[in-house]
Interface confidence: low
């Protein structure tokens, strides 16, 4: 297991498809590893775009060949399959497919696989074992849907060979390969502001930490060893270089901010919490 | 341990044909793309071959149409049938397992192909 | 195909020298360089993938640099088993292509 990854760990690729009329189309897909996004697609030159520097994995070079092949080919097939029967299927311009497809690990063993097919954000179809089956509340439109899909039984086969051989294959691969940049440990910025007043005689406390990962963090107001069940977490955002952000507020009545701290508890940290003083803060800001 | 051995050299005339093979053991034969490399006396490293863990099967462009590589996963194999060899031909070849991208991790020991009249 | 150009072609030094081998692509092959050992009578040996990764089982002395065209191999501190002959190997573009090599002899 990779430290800086939640188990279950998946690898999973994303195909949004953008249907905005009988001719005009876009896609966008991309592959993640667990939350962090490790691989996009280029669709002017049809080739998969490596973020990560390990992104590769241990395929080597022919069998990502082999890959784009297939997604560029799956890519064209999927676009006319769904013109061609969008009307029988009563999909309505504009309208959006998004299709997820990967595998999870769990305690280092391949767990299993999914592939899933939705419908305007709706859950419409789902690949099981070596075919497509409709998700029962979406209808007869997906199970004529699952029955044009499987028709090919074929192309059901490679889909099945991917989920179940080739994926696995590569998450395990991907994680010894990023071993060192997933295991890393960057320690947490911290500072305080003030956040916009909540009302008359009352204060926002932000407490901003930023720089960290891996991305699990625990972030509290205290006053002394009393954790402040008011603390707001906002979510935990992404930065550009690979580290996480996140900001926790607290409203306070503008005389009761004086014995509040912001803890900050991460493994980077070893037991050395980050500890700031909003007294410090205001006698400085 | 990864152990890759090499057989099938030997000493041809010009236009003659050889067939190789590497058995490979201590891994997962089948996870692995498959490579040919070879060494001419006294001379460089020069990419032969490869075979994909799918079966896609990539030459260099000086044996082309001449050399077919594949692999039988069930005997953890790799082959390469030479077909019209030439002089130049003449080299060590070493088969290697692909890892990192198209890095090399494991090669066998090699076996000699010698073409001449 | 991506040429592969190493300098010097050979190189004498001393035990306990520091080495330097530079490799040279004829475009940008970004990370994509992986270095090797060979001795005498011996298969290739992997020593630095991904320009400067390196492999599990060799000594820390050994380290890789560069990206894009220009990258280096070097050995921190020449040890007598260091003598042989080093290559470097693109990985970005199929046909894989390998550098002429550097025999490092002693001097």
């Known amino acids: 297991n990779a430290d800086g990854l939640k188990e279950p760990l998946s690898f999973h690729v994303t195909w949004i498809a953008s249907f905005y009329n009988h001719s005009w189309k876009q896609n966008l897909v991309s592959g993640w590893l667990s939350d962090l996004q490790t691989h996009t697609w280029d669709s002017n030159s049809s080739t998969i775009v490596f973020l990560c520097p390990w992104s590769r994995g241990n395929f080597s070079n022919e069998e990502w060949k082999e890959l784009e092949t297939l997604f560029r080919i799956r890519t064209i097939r999927s676009f006319e399959g769904i013109r061609r029967y969008a009307h029988e299927l009563q999909f309505e311009y504009p309208f959006e497919i998004q299709v997820t497809g990967g595998c999870e690990l769990h305690s280092g063993k391949v767990s299993g696989s999914f592939l899933q097919l939705a419908y305007q954000g709706s859950d419409f179809v789902s690949f099981q074992n070596n075919s497509w089956l409709p998700y029962p509340v979406a209808g007869n439109m997906a199970k004529h849907f699952c029955k044009v899909l499987n028709q090919n039984q074929h192309e059901n086969d490679i889909t099945h060979n991917l989920l179940s051989d080739t994926c696995p294959r590569f998450i395990l691969g991907l994680l010894d390969a990023g071993k060192a940049h997933l295991q890393r440990q960057v320690k947490p910025e911290a500072w305080l502001s003030h956040g916009p007043s909540p009302g008359p005689g009352h204060l926002q406390l932000v407490c901003h930490v930023s720089g960290f990962y891996p991305k699990p963090v625990w972030v509290m107001w205290m006053r002394g060893e009393q954790e402040q069940q008011g603390t707001q977490r906002g979510d935990i955002l992404p930065s550009a270089d690979g580290t996480w952000y996140l900001r926790a507020t607290l409203e306070v009545a503008a005389g009761e901010a004086a014995d509040l701290s912001c803890r900050v508890k991460h493994s980077s940290l070893e037991g050395q919490d980050i500890v700031l003083y909003w007294e410090h803060h205001s006698s400085v800001g | 341990e990864v152990q890759l051995v090499e057989s099938g050299g030997g000493l041809v005339h010009p236009g003659g044909s050889l067939r190789l093979s590497c058995a490979g053991s201590?891994?997962?034969?089948?996870?692995?793309?498959m490579h040919w490399v070879r060494q001419a006396p006294g001379k460089g490293l020069e990419w032969v071959s490869a075979?994909?863990?799918?079966?896609?099967?990539y030459y260099a462009d000086s044996v082309k149409g001449r050399f077919t590589i594949s692999r039988d996963n069930a005997k953890n194999s790799l082959y390469l049938q030479m077909n019209s060899l030439r002089a130049e031909d003449t080299a060590v070849y070493y088969c290697?397992?692909?890892?990192?991208?198209?890095?090399?991790?494991?090669w066998g020991q090699g076996t000699l192909v010698t073409v001449s009249s | 195909d991506i040429q592969m150009t190493q300098s010097p072609s050979s190189l004498s030094a001393s035990v306990g020298d520091r080495v330097t081998i530079t490799c040279r692509a004829s475009q940008s092959i970004s990370s994509y360089l992986n270095w090797y050992q060979q001795k005498p009578g011996k298969a290739p040996k992997l020593l630095i993938y991904?320009?400067?990764s390196l492999q599990s089982g060799v000594p820390s002395r050994f380290s890789g640099s560069g990206s894009g065209t220009d990258f280096t191999l070097t050995i921190s501190s020449l040890q007598p088993e260091d003598f042989a002959t080093y290559y470097c190997?693109?990985?970005?573009?199929?046909?894989?292509?390998f550098g002429q090599g550097t025999k490092v002899e002693i001097k």
């Open positions: 201590g891994f997962t034969f089948s996870s692995y793309a």
């Open positions: 190997q693109q990985s970005y573009s199929t046909p894989p292509t």
């Open positions: 290697a397992r692909s890892a990192w991208w198209l890095s090399f991790d494991s």
């Open positions: 075979i994909s863990t799918g079966g896609g099967t």
């Open positions: 991904a320009a400067s």
